[in-house]
Amino acid sequence: AMHVAQPAVVLANSRGTASFVCEYASPGKATEVRVTVLRQADSQVTEVCAATYMMGNELTFLDDSICTGTSSGNQVNLTIQGLRAMDTGLYICKVELMYPPPYYMGIGNGTQIYVIDPEPCPDSD
């Protein structure tokens, strides 16, 4: 299995955006890579977003995705937007080397993202 590293903890900003780097130790010379972000909460794992990209090119997530990202070498900088307190959880980075063979897959230990909803501004007279 391929080794995937990601930070243990990240705090989302006041606008509900969190960014973290997902780095993989590529044993092959992949030209096409797939990155998937999974969220684990209460032993349930759900897919947050996924993108396939060609080495040296931008990551392209679906138009309605809450994720954006950039790649550089064996690093992917992932940004998740629109997070709320209820979205606090463990976000796992899964990397697959899709082409050419051999196929490799690696899963990180996860990044615990903490999201704190901003306090509403008090009404001013």
């Epitope: 030209t31 996924a50 060609m54 090119n57 051999p102």
Partner: antibody
Framework: EVQLLESGGGLVQPGGSLRLSCAAS????????MSWVRQAPGKGLEWVSG????????HYADSVKGRFTISRDNSKNTLYLQMNSLRAEDTAVYYC?????????????WGQGTLVTVSS | QSVLTQPPSASGTPGQRVTISCTGS?????????VHWYQQLPGTAPKLLIY???KRPSGVPDRFSGSKSGTSASLAISGLRSEDEADYYC???????????FGGGTKLTVLG
């Protein structure tokens, strides 16, 4: 159900052209590399061409380089093989094949094949 | 001439153990690429039998096993049955050809 369905085979004269199609269903087509593999009558399997999930990377066997073109339309979940300057030795059953398990790169899904006959 | 070399035929009686070899080179099996084995019954499309040298897809009986060493690999079938009569192909990615290469195939005959 995961499925591949080839079409477009038939009888063609030497020097002629054919376009094969492979319709995929039951898996995330755009994520996975696809290949064409052929089998001449009474002979073994021969890999013809492969294309990455995005279509950005393509490889051909030397025997078809410059004559065959592989392509894919991810919006239609379809793989194509444009075959030009066909020769008698291209006569074969053509299979499209892929791996969609996310466990390995072996071809665990095959179509039923489409027969291409090159003869005058 | 296939890039991977297999014996053209093999045979055995029911219950016996049969081994099929697959020899490659430093640009495919010897380069560390995994070997996959396919079974093709008469008149049907190939079916994945063994992947990543020695792993079985679900539904494949444990009578089938694979191994790899250096530039060669082998498929072993124990407790041979009449329904095992088929063509068997090994395959691996080839670094220098930038493509998949297959063995020429081995026709397995179950005698008696």
């Amino acid at each position: 159900e995961v499925q591949l369905l080839e079409s477009g085979g038939g009888l063609v004269q030497p020097g002629g052209s054919l376009r094969l199609s492979c319709a995929a269903s039951g898996f995330t087509f755009s994520s996975y590399a696809m290949s064409w593999v052929r089998q001449a009558p009474g002979k073994g399997l021969e890999w013809v061409s492969g294309i990455s999930g995005s279509g950005g990377y393509i490889h051909y066997a030397d025997s078809v380089k410059g004559r065959f073109t592989i392509s894919r339309d991810n919006s239609k979940n379809t793989l194509y093989l444009q075959m030009n300057s066909l020769r008698a030795e291209d006569t074969a059953v053509y299979y499209c094949a892929t791996y969609s398990s996310g466990l390995h790169d072996a071809f665990d899904i095959w179509g039923q094949g489409t027969l291409v006959t090159v003869s005058s | 001439q296939s890039v991977l070399t297999q014996p053209p035929s093999a045979s055995g009686t029911p219950g016996q153990r049969v081994t099929i070899s697959c020899t490659g080179s430093s640009s495919n099996i010897g380069a560390g690429y995994d070997v996959h084995w396919y079974q093709q019954l008469p008149g049907t499309a190939p079916k994945l039998l063994i992947y990543d040298n020695n792993k079985r897809p679900s539904g494949v009986p444990d009578r089938f096993s694979g191994s790899k060493s250096g530039t060669s690999a082998s498929l072993a079938i124990s407790g041979l049955r009449s329904e095992d009569e088929a063509d068997y192909y090994c395959a691996a990615w080839d670094d220098s050809l930038n493509g998949w290469v297959f063995g020429g195939g081995t026709k397995l005959t179950v005698l008696g």
